[in-house]
Every structure is written in C-alpha cells, then in structure tokens.
C-alpha cells in the first residue's frame, strides 16, 4: 500500500436545504484507471461511512448502497454533494481515495472538511 496526498476544503457550510458540496482532489502518482472514493464522517470518536463510489477514469461515479451523495469526476478531482443533512450531521467529513487499478495500490486520506449544518427556522404563521 502506497501513500498519496488528498486535498479537500477545510470548511463548508451546508445550504438551508441541507446540501453540502466540496471537491476532493488527489495527487495521482500514475495513470489510474479505476478509483474508489469514500466519504467518512467523524464525530466524537465514531467514524461512519457516508457514501462511497467507484469509477473508471472518464466514466460516471457508481455509488454504493443507500447513498445520499451524488458526484462527478474530472481528472484527479471528484466533486461530491451530500444531501439530506441536518444540524445533527455537523461534523468532519473525510475524503478517502483508493487507486485500485492498475497496481500498485495507492491510498490517500484527506484532513477532512468540517461541514456545518444549520436547521432552517420554521416559517412564522402568516395572517395573509
């Protein structure tokens, strides 16, 4: 397993609809043809996989399991969008990138993006 640098923004604020987007960029040491990207949420000491996708270079991302994420890839960048976030989902979202093929296998883990989610205030009753 060889190490690889992964960059991601330090802070992102989710929209009022609970949507947060960020870019995960990796320094590919070679010409990878198959990549797996995983987003991990770290809150307190617990780490949970939020979403994961595999893709062949130039193709669309195929997300695994009951994913709340969407995304696109462009070169060594993956644009990720997480939906359905609530205030309780505020936390550190870490991007993990694996270059699966061809060998050798490379693994890179970003420092994380702190995503802040603020639940929208309910609209006050209107007399109109």
């Amino acid at each position: 397993c060889k190490a690889m640098h992964v960059a991601q923004p330090a802070v992102v604020l989710a929209s009022s609809r609970g949507i947060a987007s960020f870019v995960c960029e990796y320094a590919s040491p070679g010409k990878a043809t198959e990549v797996r990207v995983t987003v991990l949420r770290q809150a307190d000491s617990q780490v949970t996989e939020v979403c994961a996708a595999t893709y062949m270079m130039g193709n669309e991302l195929t997300f695994l399991d009951d994913s709340i994420c969407t995304g696109t890839s462009s070169g060594n960048q993956v644009n990720l969008t997480i939906q359905g976030l609530r205030a309780m989902d505020t936390g550190l979202y870490i991007c993990k990138v694996e270059l699966m093929y061809p060998p050798p296998y490379y693994l890179g883990i970003g420092n994380g993006t702190q995503i802040y989610v603020i639940d929208p205030e309910p609209c006050p009753d209107s007399d109109f």
């Epitope: 996989e49 695994l64 399991d65 009951d66 994913s67 709340i68 939906q83 359905g84 699966m100 093929y101």
Partner: antibody
Framework: QVQLVQSGAEVKMSGASVRVSCKAS????????ISWMRQAPGQGLEWMGW????????NYAQKLQGRVTMTTDTSTGTAYMELRSLTSDDTAVYYC????????????WGQGTLVTVSS | DIQMTQSPSSLSASVGDRVTITCRAS??????LNWYQQKPGKAPNLLIY???SLQSGVPSRFSGSGSGTDFTLTISSLQPEDFATYYC?????????FGGGTKVEIK
C-alpha cells in the same frame, strides 16, 4: 435496538405479483436505506437492490430491472419490495437488511419472508 | 460484476478443530470483504467486516484476513454452535455479490 420485522409467508401463482413489507424500529428510519436480498431453497444469497429511505432513490440488480420496485413509507418506517411476473425461479426467502457504520455491510436483518410460486 | 468464489463448498470437522475457509474475488476489492454465518431457517449473521474486523458480540475464535483478491475466515477451535453455512460478500462496488457458501458439517 434496531429491529426489522417482515410480513408473513406468501403463496403466489405464476405470473402474479408479491409485495413484502419490512417494518423498521429502534432508529431514525430516514437515516439509513434498506437493502433486499433473497435466497432460493438450498442456494446462496443474492442481492436484489436497495432504497434510500431519505429520498426514495433506488438501485436494482440488473437481472430484476423492470420486475422489481422498492418503496418506503416514512410515516410508518416501513420498506416494501414488490416483484412482478413471478415464476418458479422466484421461489425464495426474501430478506430486508440495514447497514451499520459501513456501506454494504449488514449487521441488521429481517427474519425473512418465504415466497412460494406455484404453477 | 465482481464474482466471489468460496472454497471448499462443504467440509466436515470435529469440535475443537481449526477450520479455514477461503474466498477469492474476481478483481481486487482492497479490504471490502465481509463474512456471515447462517443457520437453517435463520437470517445471516455478520461475523467479520472489512476483511478482519470482528463484529461486536462475535466470539474471538473467529478471525478474518486478506486483502486484494484472496481472503480467509478462520475458526480457531470449532464449537458445536459453529456448524452452519458461511458466506463471504464484497462491499467494494455495486452490485453487491456473495460467495456460494461453505457448509461446515459435523464429522
């Protein structure tokens, strides 16, 4: 604690449809999706697909595309799997399952629902 | 789709034996490999996830190893309650796929 309780056994005629329910409890239903697996008598496990409870997005196994529909009712915390145009090959125990902290890993399973298709 | 091949398909062993089951993926899946135990008439029970992590509540006589394409489930000292069928499953990519199963029977 997390519990998944499935509907009872069904006997169906060939060509008919079946709907299996999976009632979830012990967690916030929309925080996790539900996956469905099946197991023919004496055979191995087959992944059928999953549904994201939060937004209703679904992803089905290619061989079942067009015949299977997975839905959720967030008001009752229940997931449903409907399979149409049944044949004897669809005779199986159908399971719903939920992931834990890791994607595609299933610590939580329903008890199973036997669907028998007779011709 | 990723094919998962388990071997052997069945084995006979005695209480106290060390049992090893192997699982091979048709392509590299890193450590995204899980093991389940299933008893007749019951749902599968998760034993090992991500190749080597022991699921909470599972006895320590169960262990998993491997990465890439080749994986192993080991039962260090077989107990009467361990006679069951064991399945591997990859969680690397969709569609999720299972091995054909290994039935562990009493010798």
């Amino acid at each position: 604690q997390v519990q998944l309780v499935q509907s009872g056994a069904e006997v169906k005629m060939s060509g008919a449809s079946v709907r299996v329910s999976c009632k979830a409890s012990g967690y916030t239903f929309t925080s996790y999706g539900i996956s469905w697996m099946r197991q023919a008598p004496g055979q191995g496990l087959e992944w059928m697909g999953w549904i994201t409870a939060y937004n209703g997005n679904s992803n089905y196994a290619q061989k079942l595309q067009g015949r299977v529909t997975m839905t959720t009712d967030t008001s009752t915390g229940t997931a449903y799997m409907e399979l149409r145009s049944l044949t004897s090959d669809d005779t199986a125990v159908y399971y719903c399952a939920r992931r834990g902290d890791y994607l595609g890993v299933f610590p939580y399973w329903g008890q199973g629902t036997l669907v028998t298709v007779s011709s | 789709d990723i094919q998962m091949t388990q071997s052997p398909s069945s084995l006979s062993a005695s209480v106290g034996d060390r049992v090893t089951i192997t699982c091979r993926a048709s392509q590299s899946i890193s450590s995204y490999l899980n093991w389940y135990q299933q008893k007749p008439g019951k749902a599968p029970n998760l034993l090992i996830y991500t190749a080597s992590s022991l699921q909470s509540g599972v006895p320590s006589r169960f262990s998993g190893s491997g990465s890439g394409t080749d994986f192993t489930l080991t039962i260090s000292s077989l107990q009467p309650e361990d006679f069951a069928t064991y399945y591997c499953q990859q969680s690397y990519s969709s569609p999720l796929t299972f091995g054909g199963g290994t039935k562990v029977e009493i010798k």
